[in-house]
Interface confidence: low
């Protein structure tokens, strides 16, 4: 009769370094000791008639265990194959390029050390959770590669490597190990240089905006911009909108930078650089400066207006070019009330690198005159019906504008510019006094108040007064015009003070 020796469990699978409880049993009616033959560390846990139980510890590799027992003068054996599975010790994705141009291929490379059984080990390369490649792990260490075409969508995408140890047929499940992810940075840098908008000319100690723009840049936010005026780096504010990057800075020219200079804009992305350069001329242009002998003068004062600019500039004073053409001009005048508020404008033109640069300065003359009180603006006689609404009007002229007061008997004021109901109290002669820092003038103003019963007489008197007044005024104006013409003729014979006297003062 043939007896059997059973070993349980049959062909077990366990994780590396694990322990295993093994039972050997036979139907042979022998009380012989059952032996376990293995190189593994073992310990007898218990035994009985026809059976023995062992504990195997620190099982690190695949192994075949054998149980044997003597039975009726012969030996019977039983065996079991232990399969040890182990997760890889190292799963690593090789570093990616620091920057990868969009549209070019790059290689993903994964190295796997350890892991068993190799027949059940697969290596998967991933972008996010998308499988790019699946290959068996063969050599030790195993290396798996995949070629990927870089796209804009890959920017910032995590790439990783995953190992799958499939122990599902053994009822143990799928063991997954994943490498640390590596983030890819992709970029697009157009071949075109940036657009540089900069001034062609820049005056010393002045500032001007400089703009540098590059379109079709991805990712625009990662680009580095260098803006400089000559060797002076400019503090740029960088903005990006979509695929467009704009760097704005303020260029301020220093005195030591005078002459031909270059404005440079460098845009660097992904280790590549695009550059734009623009020529710029830094120039110095002082003036023009307009000087009045005095900005505020009294009527009749002689005033000299001088204009001076950069030595190489050509100036024009009140539209009249300097004679000879040069950096200085002047004119002389005798101040009249009409000159109050008059502007004296000096324009200077300087040629810089074939381009004309213009500058202006304007000064205003203040002429002090007056005060004045005349019939036109302050009539000497008013006749008003009693109880009518009237507004006494009297305007004093002068610079500064005089203060005006009209008093009857030194106390009773005439309400100038206010609407009043005419009463008998209003009648009388008022002394109007216009006063300013330039002096004072007085004028008598008579107010007549008409009682209602004299209306017809009054109308006649007023009509006669108007006719006589008109005739008188016409005579006065005619004589005044004659006197003015005569005065101008005399002045012309002496030499006109108003004529611009432009001259170039020697340097």
């Amino acid at each position: 009769q043939e007896f059997l020796l059973r070993v349980e469990p049959q062909n077990p699978v366990l994780s590396a370094g694990g322990s295993l409880f093994v039972n050997c049993s036979t139907d042979c009616p022998s009380s012989e000791k059952i032996a376990l033959e293995t190189s593994l560390s073992k310990e007898l846990v218990a035994s009985g008639m026809g059976w023995a139980a062992f504990n195997l510890s620190n099982v690190t590799g695949n192994s075949r265990i054998l149980c044997s027992v003597y039975c009726n003068g012969s030996q019977i054996t039983g065996s079991s194959n232990i399969t040890v599975y182990g997760l890889p010790e190292r799963v690593e994705l090789a570093p990616l390029p620091p920057w990868q141009p969009v549209g070019q291929n790059f290689t993903l490379r994964c190295q796997v050390e350890g892991g068993s059984p190799r027949t059940s080990l697969t290596v998967v390369l991933l972008r996010w959770e998308e499988e790019l490649s699946r290959q068996p792990a063969v050599e030790e260490p195993a290396e798996v590669t995949a070629t990927v075409l870089a796209s804009r969508d890959d920017h910032g995408a995590p790439f990783s490597c995953r190992t799958e140890l499939d122990m599902q047929p053994q009822g143990l499940g799928l063991f997954v190990n994943t490498s640390a992810p590596r983030q890819l940075r992709t970029f697009v840098l157009p071949v075109t240089p940036p657009r540089l908008v900069a001034p062609r000319f820049l005056e010393v100690e002045t500032s001007w905006p400089v703009d540098c723009t590059l379109d079709g840049l991805f990712p625009a936010s990662e680009a580095q911009v260098y803006l400089a005026l000559g060797d002076q780096m400019l503090n740029a504010t960088v903005m990006n909108h979509g695929d467009t990057l704009t760097a704005t800075a303020t260029a301020t020219a220093r005195a030591d930078q005078e002459g031909a200079r270059e404005i440079v804009c460098n845009v660097t992305l992904g280790g590549e650089r695009r550059e734009a350069r623009e020529n710029l001329t830094v120039f110095s242009f002082l003036g023009p400066i307009v000087n009045l002998t005095k900005p505020e003068v009294s009527e009749g004062t002689e005033v000299t207006v001088k204009c001076e600019a950069h030595p190489r500039a050509k100036v024009t004073l009140n539209g009249v070019p300097a004679q000879p053409l040069g950096p200085r001009a002047q004119l002389l005048l005798k101040a009249t009330p009409e000159d109050n508020g008059r502007s004296f404008s000096c324009s200077a033109t300087l040629e810089v690198a074939g381009q004309l640069i213009h500058k202006n300065q304007t000064r205003e003359l203040r002429v002090l005159y007056g005060p004045r009180l005349d019939e036109r603006d302050c009539p000497g006689n008013w006749t008003w019906p009693e109880n009518s609404q009237q507004t006494p009007m009297c305007q004093a002229w002068g610079n500064p504008l005089p203060e005006l007061k009209c008093l009857k008997d030194g106390t009773f004021p005439l309400p100038i510019g206010e609407s009043v109901t005419v009463t008998r109290d209003l009648e009388g002669t008022y002394l109007c006094r216009a006063r300013s820092t330039q002096g004072e003038v007085t004028r008598k103003v008579t107010v007549n108040v008409l009682s209602p019963r004299y209306e017809i007489v009054i109308i006649t008197v007023v009509a006669a007064a108007v006719i006589m007044g008109t005739a008188g005024l016409s005579t006065y104006l005619y004589n005044r015009q004659r006197k003015i013409k005569k005065y101008r003729l005399q002045q012309a014979q002496k030499g006109t003070p108003m004529k611009p006297n432009t001259q170039a003062t020697p340097p």
Epitope: N235, T237, T248, T250
Partner: antibody, heavy 119, light 106 residues
Framework: QVQLQQSGAELADPGASVKMSCKAS????????MHWVKQRPGQGLEWIGY????????EYNQRFQDKATLTADKSSSTAYMQLSSLTSEDSAVYYC????????????WGQGTSVTVSS | QIVLTQSPALMSASPGEKVTMTCSAS?????IYWYQQKPRSSPKPWIY???NLASGVPARFSGSGSGASYSLTISIMEAEDAATYYC?????????FGAGTKLELK
């Protein structure tokens, strides 16, 4: 060194407007955003808005959208804030403060302009 | 808008004591800033990007936190630390400040 010099105290009637200034020195004015902050007596800080002096772009706290107007003059490196239709609720100290970037926050502050609204 | 809630509103501490004040955001923020203000003075930057001390701030101060919960700690209180401390965020418009924690000397 960086300095923000604000204009002096203001006393205004209800319904009137005030315009205060903040003169910057010691750095390139156009580079940094200028913020304005309100602090009522014994109260906390309240953000009004900011201006980018380089582009004159402004962004306001909605609460101050119709109250404050922020402007900047590049030539004098000065930021301005005008407060309109004043009420007693606008009586406060107003600060200008430079935003130095994420690594610094509001790194430089003016000494404050006190506004008192009273009839 | 993101509301920052500071607690406590008022606290007092003796010299040598450890002090902790908190700042809670109504929604998650990446980082916050802290400012110190003393009476009749402008606020001063104190802590930036949650945990970095501004120039001239004593090392006894520290900041920590993430998400919606942040704190400022003084390891050993000193008399000069008595002030009001404000937290601030600018994850979204409007920029907001906490109502402040007033720290008094006991």
């Amino acid at each position: 060194q960086v300095q923000l010099q604000q204009s002096g105290a203001e006393l205004a009637d209800p319904g009137a407007s005030v315009k205060m200034s903040c003169k910057a020195s010691g750095y390139t004015f156009t580079v940094y955003w200028m913020h304005w902050v309100k602090q009522r007596p014994g109260q906390g800080l309240e953000w009004i808005g900011y201006i980018n002096p380089n582009t004159d772009y402004t962004e306001y706290n909605q609460r101050f959208q119709d109250k404050a107007t922020l402007t900047a003059d590049k030539s004098s490196s000065t930021a301005y804030m005008q407060l309109s239709s004043l009420t007693s609720e606008d009586s406060a100290v107003y600060y200008c403060a430079r935003w130095g970037g994420n690594s610094y926050g509001l790194d430089y502050w003016g000494q404050g302009t006190s506004v008192t609204v009273s009839s | 808008q993101i509301v920052l809630t500071q607690s406590p509103a008022l606290m007092s501490a003796s010299p040598g004591e450890k002090v902790t004040m908190t700042c809670s955001a109504s929604s998650s923020v990446s980082y916050i800033y802290w400012y110190q203000q003393k009476p009749r003075s402008s606020p001063k930057p104190w802590i930036y990007l949650t945990s970095n001390l501004a120039s001239g701030v004593p090392a006894r101060f520290s900041g920590s936190g993430s998400g919606a919960s942040y704190s400022l700690t003084i390891s050993i209180m000193e008399a000069e630390d008595a002030a009001t401390y404000y937290c601030q965020q600018w994850k979204s418009i409007p920029l907001t400040f906490g109502a402040g924690t007033k720290l008094e000397l006991k």
